[in-house]
Amino acid sequence: YDFTNCDFEKIKAAYLSTISKDLITYMSGTKSTEFNNTVSCSNRPHCLTEIQSLTFNPTAGCASLAKEMFAMKTKAALAIWCPGYSETQINATQAMKKRRKRKVTTNKCLEQVSQLQGLWRRFNRPLLKQQ
């Protein structure tokens, strides 16, 4: 999906209003310095691409974040403010249902959510030059 036509300001407002708080809740008990940010993004569409990938694609050591509250809200925000996003996700959702596993918060998942926090922060500051 090409995130170029999303309403970035609305997605930013949704993040600041509620998604950010859910990410903090997920990470509660973890020091903010515990993980290094290794994933970066260069502009808002790129940030949303990386956010979608890290939130919804299973990775080794972190089978699924998709049922976490921050993920459900992220999916909803993209569905509302990215035209056509919902339609592109129907097949992906059906595939995900088949391989759904029970929720387990592993250290790898905590690291992944820490990366997500960094991507969201970057998304909210689009005019900053890449380090």
């Epitope: 949704a14 209003s17 999916k75 509302i80």
Partner: nanobody, 132 residues
Framework: QLQLVESGGGLVQAGGSLRLSCAAS????????IAWFRQAPGKEREGVSF????????YYADSVKGRFTISSDNAKNTVYLQMDSLKPDDTADYYC?????????????????????????WGQGTQVTVSS
Amino acid sequence: QLQLVESGGGLVQAGGSLRLSCAASGFNFDDYAIAWFRQAPGKEREGVSFISNSDGTAYYADSVKGRFTISSDNAKNTVYLQMDSLKPDDTADYYCAAEGRMGTHSRDSVYFWSFSALYDYWGQGTQVTVSS
């Protein structure tokens, strides 16, 4: 241009009722979501209720569930908030607000409808005072 005009506020005794109206003009009403917010003196603006004009889906704040009812008359481009069993705590300025994408994505909007930062257009407000 897009305009929202509220009416129906006033002074009422505890236990009484009021019906607020939000008349909209200047946009395709059917595609929009309309929400009611309220703000009491010294407090933050809070979401009261939401309706999708495309499918009629409605959401309510816990504090008004069972007492307030939101409805929409698409022919008149007007949204109503019927407020029953009013309490002194309901005293506030009431505002209606419109947003252009949540109206056609009402199921996904359950997470976001109550956040004022997401709305593009606002009315000037109507005052509701509930005396004990």
